[in-house]
Amino acid sequence: IVGGTNSSWGEWPWQVSLQVKLTAQRHLCGGSLIGHQWVLTAAHCFDGLPLQDVWRIYSGILNLSDITKDTPFSQIKEIIIHQNYKVSEGNHDIALIKLQAPLNYTEFQKPICLPSKGDTSTIYTNCWVTGWGFSKEKGEIQNILQKVNIPLVTNEECQKRYQDYKITQRMVCAGYKEGGKDACKGDSGGPLVCKHNGMWRLVGITSWGEGCARREQPGVYTKVAEYMDWILEKTQSSDGKAQMQSPA
């Protein structure tokens, strides 16, 4: 996160850290807890690393430096990448992770509400992006979970800023015209959440941007409301009956 500040304990209890353990262990992506056994993240996090066994998912944590070999983590039972996601395109950058064992909810570890299907009428004015990603383009992973308040921008405006790309209706953009605040490398898959009528909702999944926090280059997020049918289909068919945080 560029231009952000430190988060507090329990402020974003749905935020998880997706880490890979090969020779060393490192944080690669963020994700959002959406049910006892489900995490929503970006499909591109798994490019080149589709093996379930190498991943460790840490929930209920604030500081990555607090993780030791004794820190509990979740393992992956199943990775469900959107069937239309292609490595050669930037569309449908969404994936579900089914955890091997369900998580108990606590003050520091609980799910985010999902939006209503095809939610286009709600005007979100209080949106935040969180993650442990770089604090500048050529930076490094941060220890303490960062947060930043960023306004949504229209898809029309976003398309003007990204003429070389196709900004679809299944994407949502956020950023300041002058730049300075944005997600960055390592924040991928994490949440863009907006507070509406006193409730936090998962509006976007951190997907991509041209650099980080550059002027007139908003961040682009996968629009969760556009994938509600897919999310419900996959979680219910896998679970029988999904333990989901119901759409608001």
Partner: antibody, heavy 125, light 108 residues
């Protein structure tokens, strides 16, 4: 299966014009940036131009700027290169290529993942 | 413009040997925008590596890419007869997009 098929090459006199076409199939053409690359006989590869998915944004190499025009017709899945004021140094095999733009570590990637077989343009009197 | 300089110009090796090809850029290039292509006589180029180190679909694992910033490398761990060709690096980090001049890998 992704396929790109160029046509329109041939022999043309200096100062003349030629229009190359590239017929695309096997993918959603309107989602992809497309590019032209050329290769003079016995030489290396030279990027010529690219066009955005909508066709609203185009960029050219300095060597062809003002003489060549790239365009596309998404309804026909076809890419074009209009070449005017041709010179001897434009003699080359012209390839069209699809520009893949995936995502890695919250940044976009960019590379030419599929190429046509090429069409030869010879500029000579 | 960003100039890509490949070395050596020609590499003479025998099948089974290891080939190391270098590509240096005149300015910083984001790894995501660095690719390697193989070209055989009379054929169109073929994508080998994208994002500096990711193998394209169907490319054997004897091909690997590495590097960052201004220094990139393509390695062929054990040359097969079909690997003798010309190899190009290419950047699309900034326009004009540019290619290296190529490295020819020939049979010794």
């Amino acid at each position: 299966e992704v396929q790109l098929l160029e046509s329109g090459g041939g022999l043309v006199q200096p100062g003349g014009s030629l229009r190359l076409s590239c017929a695309a199939s096997g993918f959603t053409f309107s989602h992809y940036l497309m590019t032209w690359v050329r290769q003079a006989p016995g030489k290396g590869l030279e990027w010529v131009s690219y066009i955005s998915p909508s066709g609203g944004h185009t960029i050219y190499a300095d060597s062809v700027k003002g003489r060549f025009t790239i365009s596309r017709d998404n309804s026909k899945n076809t890419l074009y290169l209009q070449m005017n004021s041709l010179r001897a140094e434009d003699t080359a095999v012209y390839y069209c290529a699809r520009v893949a733009r995936g995502i890695a570590a919250r940044s976009r990637t960019s590379y030419f993942d599929y190429w046509g077989q090429g069409t030869l343009v010879t500029v000579s009197s | 413009e960003i100039v890509l300089t490949q070395s050596p110009g020609t590499l003479s090796l025998s099948p089974g040997e290891r080939a190391t090809l270098s590509c240096r850029t005149s300015q910083f290039v984001n790894s995501n925008y660095l690719a390697w292509y193989q070209q055989k006589p009379g054929q169109a180029p073929r994508l080998l590596i994208y994002g500096a180190s990711s193998r394209a679909t169907g490319i054997p694992d004897r091909f690997s890419g590495s590097g960052s910033g201004t220094d990139f490398t393509l390695t062929i761990s054990r040359l097969e007869p079909e690997d003798f060709a010309v190899y190009y690096c290419q950047q699309s980090s900034r326009t004009p997009w540019t290619f290296g001049q190529g490295t020819k890998v020939e049979i010794k």
